[in-house]
Amino acid sequence: HQKKVVPWIDVYARATCQPREVVVPLSMELMGNVVKQLVPSCVTVQRCGGCCPDDGLECVPTGQHQVRMQILMIQYPSSQLGEMSLEEHSQCECRPKKK
Amino acid sequence: HQKKVVPWIDVYARATCQPREVVVPLSMELMGNVVKQLVPSCVTVQRCGGCCPDDGLECVPTGQHQVRMQILMIQYPSSQLGEMSLEEHSQCECRPKKK
């Protein structure tokens, strides 16, 4: 049977602008032409997302930092762990859109 | 100072194909021309996402259901709560890409 309906306030609170986990595909170009494959081929980071209460506003980061993560670089003859740094958002805000 | 590096196993586990919360913008077209605005203008649902260990595989849903949620429909002179049904994924799998 179908689950109960999600109440409006919960729908609203979950949907609004806030840091949320997003999947970012990794670009092989970053690693030079020696690397044959990256494992994983995508990573997850916290980024601002969701909607703002008013059409004239947009969801933007107001707090950010770099997060470092280990990535397996498959090379021949050997493979090795590398490190990658990506921007992560810790705070967001609904701000008037730039004209 | 910069946080510690995220270990490879954790990076891999978080990035793999699984149900994850995504933001879905709502289309006003769904509601007819009486409705002036939907609040919120987007919702969150669980959808399959992330990457598969091999380029020949893609992340697809193997379990899904409909989730019902309340949306405020702003109309004139009055506004009212409506209900919307969206597909949500409960299970995912890495399957060979269709040729």
Epitope: W8, I9, Y12, A13, T16, C17, Q18, G50, C52, P53, D54, G56, L57, Q91, C92, E93, C94, R95, P96 | Q37, V39, Q70, L72, I74, S78, S79, Q80, L81
Partner: antibody, heavy 119, light 107 residues
Amino acid sequence: QVQLQQSGPELVKPGTSVRISCKASGYTFTTFYIHWVKQRPGQGLEWIGWFYPGNVNTNYNEKLKGKATLTADKSSSAAYLQLNSLTSEDSAVYFCTRSPYYGYVFDYWGQGTTLTVSS
Amino acid sequence: DIVMTQSHKFMSTSVGDRVSITCKASQDVGTAVAWYQQKPGQSPKLLIYWASTRHTGVPDRFTGSGSGTDFTLTISNVQSEDLADYFCQQYSSSLTFGAGATKLELK
């Protein structure tokens, strides 16, 4: 978790003014409206007005216009209620609360700030 | 201004009873009505909004109904922790609370 933390009790003299603060945490400050509500002892609730931190719009109860001024500081996620030309009629508990856009439904409330106006 | 009238200032009940608290709007407010519970020394707590939507975490013995000008909060199987003040609120045009609460007390 969402919290609205208000400043402590105030005892002030008639004719002066006071500023009550409400510090929001656990959510994105600019996605909800902040409202202020007055409650006199043994009486009902009276809405003072709202402040929307996203575009700094305000809306006041016509009856209380000129008595109250609503502001906020986005950088600290704090909202403020300033009351001026205080009289004994302003002695009350003041609550800050939040609501979604458009449907002014109050899902979280501050603990209340008691204001006593007395000479 | 829209006036919200809660005709009963006090309502007596017993544990296990069913009780209905009413609220009347001076003009049509659609379904833009919420109900709050307040206990002494505490902040109000949201129970029902849009006339009939139960807020998350609120026991299902609380139900709201009505539209237009007449609204009802029903508590079935009253528990001792339900003894409190109850306010209605309209947010169709500006925002007003019931003029005075309905106090639910034991018989």
